[in-house]
Amino acid sequence: ELPKPSISSNNSKPVEDKDAVAFTCEPEAQNTTYLWWVNGQSLPVSPRLQLSNGNRTLTLFNVTRNDARAYVCGIQNSVSANRSDPVTLDVLYGPDTPIISPPDSSYLSGANLNLSCHSASNPSPQYSWRINGIPQQHTQVLFIAKITPNNNGTYACFVSNLATGRNNSIVKSITVSASGTSPGLSA
């Protein structure tokens, strides 16, 4: 009788748009059919998926974050069959272009400025801010109490993913008007 199979991988943490991953269904057995499923479904037709080695090896080329799914292999012969436990692929990606919220760019003097930066990334990225090119704290949220027109300028959020070796950033212009002189928003 066939044993419960297992899945081995040549790359446990592939990087999006860069790496390939080869899953192999163990053990190797003669006169055995090897089958694969992704998230409980049969393999989709895709030029990035390739079966080889008598269907025992499943290769994903140029992995994307959408490939971070549960992979299962099965083995079957004329007298028995069995399926592996699922193996979930951990795809490293990002950081994507960050988003600064709220989207407001005009503020009244005396308001609190509370900017949050978010970037899709696995693992979570490191965040840092620069105001008019000057480095600020390494936090996801930038808070400045009671802003004045002196706080006018460009606010840049920088994100870095050490696992993928990639960086990204976005710049936002902030205008602070003296109280009562602008219809700008008050935070």
């Epitope: 409980g40 069995n82 399926r83």
Partner: nanobody, 120 residues
Framework: EVQLVESGGGLVQPGGSLRLSCAAS????????MGWFRQAPGKEREFVAS????????YATDSVKTRFTISRDSAKTTVYLQMNSLRPEDTAVYYC?????????????WGQGTQVTVSS
């Protein structure tokens, strides 16, 4: 030894209903697909329906899908085939089977079969 034990077959009039059951002797079947094949006199054995390990179902034809319903118990070791609106052409020996992707690959595990006869 692995065993699949079927029950529920019999003689029924056209338009009637039957419920087939198939119990597996081992818990490893929770990781396998279970389903039903049938063989009419003088014909080859054909796939009817299956319940996959992941909770999906597959049916041979739309005609079967509209009249038959396959289901599985929570332990995934017993499979049922509820057959409604039976027709004379449904007369066959119905076999329970277990394996991987039953509709595409010949399964390794088979029951002994249960006779279903639709006749007035």
């Amino acid at each position: 030894e692995v065993q699949l034990v079927e029950s529920g077959g019999g003689l029924v009039q056209p338009g009637g209903s039957l419920r087939l059951s198939c119990a597996a002797s081992r818990g490893t079947f929770s990781r396998l697909d279970m389903g039903w094949f049938r063989q009419a006199p003088g014909k080859e054995r054909e796939f009817v329906a299956s319940s996959t390990w992941s909770g999906g179902t597959a049916y041979a034809t739309d005609s079967v899908k509209t009249r038959f319903t396959i289901s599985r118990d929570s332990a995934k070791t017993t499979v049922y085939l509820q057959m409604n609106s039976l027709r004379p052409e449904d007369t066959a020996v119905y076999y329970c089977a277990a394996g991987l992707s039953l509709e595409q690959h010949t399964p390794p595990y088979w029951g002994q079969g249960t006779q279903v006869t639709v006749s007035s």
